[in-house]
Structures are given as structure tokens and as C-alpha cells.
Amino acid sequence: EEELQVIQPDKSVLVAAGETATLRCTATSLIPVGPIQWFRGAGPGRELIYNQKEGHFPRVTTVSDLTKRNNMDFSIRIGNITPADAGTYYCVKFRKGSPDDVEFKSGAGTELSVRAKPSAPVVSGPAARATPQHTVSFTCESHGFSPRDITLKWFKNGNELSDFQTNVDPVGESVSYSIHSTAKVVLTREDVHSQVICEVAHVTLQGDPLRGTANLSETIRVPPTLEVTQQPVRAENQVNVTCQVRKFYPQRLQLTWLENGNVSRTETASTVTENKDGTYNWMSWLLVNVSAHRDDVKLTCQVEHDGQPAVSKSHDLKVSAHPKEQGSNTAAENTGSNERNIY
């Protein structure tokens, strides 16, 4: 009778993570009698996957009933496959021995490759906000995918970006891989509503790439422009001065009126109007009682935006003669203002 051979017909098996892998193995003879064992890897460090004789292997089931006397099919199924299961599996026939069974013949091995989906890309921007015309970096990370081949693209508002660097780690063989990419984006004043998108394409995604997004509203700071104007007389001896705070983002803003350098009033932007580009406008006005002043008055509108150093705009109020009417006041212009008379 010909000597027993252990046949593993599949050189390689490809399985998606979470699925069940079937590793096929048959023997050409029943003798010599003895158990089979499955190992991952070869040599002294090999890992026992299944032992027909003893042990508890909850993820492993046999394809056929190995307790049947004439069984020569030693195929196994491994459930809930993860990338960590990748490797070469050997079906090994032992003959009975004492005190231990003796390895008799090994199959040629089956390489198990695991296809694992990348995790949802996570895009993160800079820790601090930046202003238009500045270049900021965004990072995109995705983990746990296999095989190593992967494609990553960056977009800003649907337009593909070209200034980015991508690394896939580790460089050598691994059960699973991670991708890390850094893109550089130049901010413009119109970017409050903009989005940066990181798109990852992988064989496991069947043409439906994963996307991670970052809103530039979390990154950008658009500093305000200030304009201080003197409005028409409201009543005898009273002048209305407005400070128009335009095109700022985010909303966090504090305004202080100074009268000849002295703090007159401080207020926080509350009822703002939003522009189409996502920036905000706000107006504050100050009612000045001219009769309380003998000399000209220097009114300053000082704005502290989003914790940045204050910017200011001044207006010289002449008190030598009564001002003439300059246009009209509308309710809209006064929205969000607080009337404070200065005496």
C-alpha cells in the first residue's frame, strides 16, 4: 500500500473579515492510525489551530465527522475571520506514539488572506483657527484594512486637491494596515461653508469609497472689517454713532465703545445677520449727548474677535456746531443695538 499523503488542494484562500474560512485537507490513506492537527505557521513557533484529539477550539468546526472510522477528510472551517487570522495553515497527520503522538506527514499548506475593510476615515484639522490666505494642514486616518493596496484622494468642495502626502503602514507584511495622509489647504474668505473631504477606495468596498469630512467652519477665522459713521441727529443735542462690524466668523465677538479713551460701554454680539458666505454682520450704535461735551470727542469702536487682539476704528465728533441731518435711521440699522446715553 502506498504511503499516506496529506493533500491540501488550495494553495491560497481569500476571505472577507467576519466571514468563515474553509481550509481543505484530505489524507490518501487511513493508516497509520493517528490524529490530525492544524497549525498556523511552521517550525517550533507554530500555533495550534485545531487538535482532533483534545482541546477546546470554539471557532473551529470540522467539515466531516472525524470520529467516523473511515474518515479521510480533515477539512476545517474557522468562523468570524479577522485580519489577525492571516497566515499559512498546515494540516498535519500524526501517528500514534508514546508518550506523545509522532508527526508523520504535513500538507503543503494553505495561505489564508483576509480582506478587511478600512475603518471610516477620520479627518482632523489644525488645533487653532487660521485666517484667509493662510495654509492649513488636514490629516486623514483609516485603519485595519487588508490587503495593503488602497487609494486616498482629497477634495475641497468637490475639487480634487493635489498638495498632500500619504503613508501606508507598516511598510512590510502585516495582518492589517493603516493609512495616514496630510493635505495642505489655502483658506479664502469664502470658506466658512467649505468642506474638506478625504476619500478612501479599497477592494473590499466594491467601488463605494468611504469618506471623511471636515468643515472649514471649524478651522477658519475671518476677521471683521469696521466702519464707524455718524448718523443724523436723533434729538436736540444728540448724535447717533454706529459701528458696522462686517464679514466676521465665528460669531464670538465683543465690542467696546471708548469716549476719549475711556470705556463707555461693552457688549457681546448677539443678534447678528448672516451673509450668504456664512460670515456675520453686526452693528452697534452709541447715542452721544453733545451738550455734555465742551471739546471735540474721539469715539472709538474696539472689537475683540474670537479671542484675538483687539482691532479698532475711531471717529472724531465735532461739538463746536450742531450736526446736520445725514440720511435717515431705519429699524434694521438699529437691530441688536443697545441705547446708552452718555452724560
Epitope: E1, P32, V33, Q52, T67, N71, R95, G97
Partner: antibody
Framework: QVQLVQSGAEVKKPGASVKVSCKAS????????ISWVRQAPGQGLEWMGW????????NYAQKLQGRVTMTTDTSTSTAYMELRSLRSDDTAVYYC?????????????WGRGTLVTVSS | DIQMTQSPSSVSASVGDRVTITCRAS??????LAWYQQKPGKAPKLLIY???NLQSGVPSRFSGSGSGTDFTLTISSLQPEDFATYYC?????????FGGGTKVEIK
């Protein structure tokens, strides 16, 4: 025909030795192990030991250690069991049995038995 | 060593009866248990291997069950040729051990 044929009955004096043979036919002798089991008159079955017909490894029951030797001759497909320093309580029918389990031990083929009587 | 305890040691039954013999191992032996039938002056004959597998040529009225430490041999309808002594045997590890036997006698 698959069978195990054992040597004939033996009468031995205490202190003597006995060697029982078991010739296999009809199957590949080297593919299986052989166990020896004995049964004293009116008693149950007692396993004595096992030998691999392929590699010659042995495993003996503790109580017989030092007195029993099991061997095989693959050229004649024969297994042997020698028991030394015989005592009267060694009187029994001695069976050879083919061990056929793949990852366990059971005996699917038995010899007819050899009666060994130890008497002064 | 693994001790095998068989019960009952004897049972009286009639043809057609259902007979159950139990065997308990002193420690877990997975499914590595065999049952044998022995008639006077004859060698034992394998009936069941690996706890529940019927040996080739054995009538289907014989069945085995159990795993771990508790095992059962059942003869569903006793026939005249079934009157004999039955032994269980653990095949999990050396030394191999047998139960004390159960004698099935005619009532």
C-alpha cells in the same frame, strides 16, 4: 481475511517467563497499534500495554512495568508479549487486539486469546 | 488513572426489552469511549466507538450516547443473542481502562 492469530495455551511454573505471539494478516500491520489485554478466570478485562507497530513505541500498565516487554516483527507482521517472573495471579486468557481509533484508543479486531496457566 | 464505573453490574431482562447500561468516567474523556460485548469463552467484540458510532456489522438496536464523564449503552429491543457481558472502555489516554462489566441475563 483480516485476523489476529495467537499462539497456543501455555502452562508455566511461578517465576518463569512466557512469550505469546500474535500474527496479523489481511491488513497493513505497520498502520495500527497492538494492545494486550488479559482476563483472569471469572474477572473483567485488564489492559496490559500498547505497542506501535510502526515505530515500536510502547506504553505499559504501571503494575506490570519491569515484568512485561512488547515487541513487533514487521517482516512477519507479528506482535509479541513477554511476561516474566510469573505468579499464580497471572493466570489468565491473554488477548492481542488491534487498536484502530484515529485520535483515541479502541480495539476493533481481537485474537482468540491464549490461556496462560501459572501453577506449581 | 481514569477509573470507569459501570452500572448495574448485572441486569435480568426478557427478549424485546429495552436495556440501558451506564458508564461513568472519573474525569472527562470527551467522546473517547467504546463499548464491547463478550460471550463466555470468546474474545470481546467492539459494538460502539467514539461514544456513539456503531461499528461496522453491529445491529442498529445497539446505540451509544454521552460525552465528558457520563455515557450510556442502549439495546432497544433485546434479542436472544444479546445475552452477554458488556464492558465500557475509555480510550482518551494511557493507561487504557475498562469498566467492571455488566452481565445481561435472561429473566
Amino acid at each position: 481475511q483480516v485476523q489476529l492469530v495467537q499462539s497456543g495455551a501455555e502452562v508455566k511454573k511461578p517465576g518463569a517467563s512466557v512469550k505469546v505471539s500474535c500474527k496479523a494478516s489481511g491488513y497493513t500491520f505497520g498502520g495500527y497499534g497492538i494492545s494486550w489485554v488479559r482476563q483472569a478466570p471469572g474477572q473483567g478485562l485488564e489492559w496490559m500495554g500498547w505497542i506501535s507497530a510502526y515505530g515500536g513505541e510502547t506504553n505499559y500498565a504501571q503494575k506490570l512495568q519491569g515484568r512485561v516487554t512488547m515487541t513487533t516483527d514487521t517482516s512477519t507482521s507479528t506482535a509479541y508479549m513477554e511476561l516474566r517472573s510469573l505468579r499464580s495471579d497471572d493466570t489468565a486468557v491473554y488477548y492481542c487486539a488491534r487498536e484502530a481509533g484515529s485520535s483515541w484508543y479502541d480495539f476493533d479486531l481481537w485474537g482468540r486469546g491464549t490461556l496462560v496457566t501459572v501453577s506449581s | 488513572d481514569i477509573q470507569m464505573t459501570q452500572s448495574p453490574s448485572s441486569v435480568s431482562a426478557s427478549v424485546g426489552d429495552r436495556v440501558t447500561i451506564t458508564c461513568r468516567a472519573s474525569q472527562g474523556i470527551s467522546s473517547w469511549l467504546a463499548w464491547y460485548q463478550q460471550k463466555p469463552g470468546k474474545a470481546p467484540k467492539l459494538l460502539i466507538y467514539a461514544a456513539s458510532n456503531l461499528q461496522s456489522g453491529v445491529p442498529s438496536r445497539f446505540s451509544g450516547s454521552g460525552s465528558g464523564t457520563d455515557f450510556t449503552l442502549t439495546i432497544s429491543s433485546l434479542q436472544p443473542e444479546d445475552f452477554a457481558t458488556y464492558y465500557c472502555q475509555q480510550g482518551a489516554s494511557f493507561p487504557i481502562t475498562f469498566g467492571g462489566g455488566t452481565k445481561v441475563e435472561i429473566k
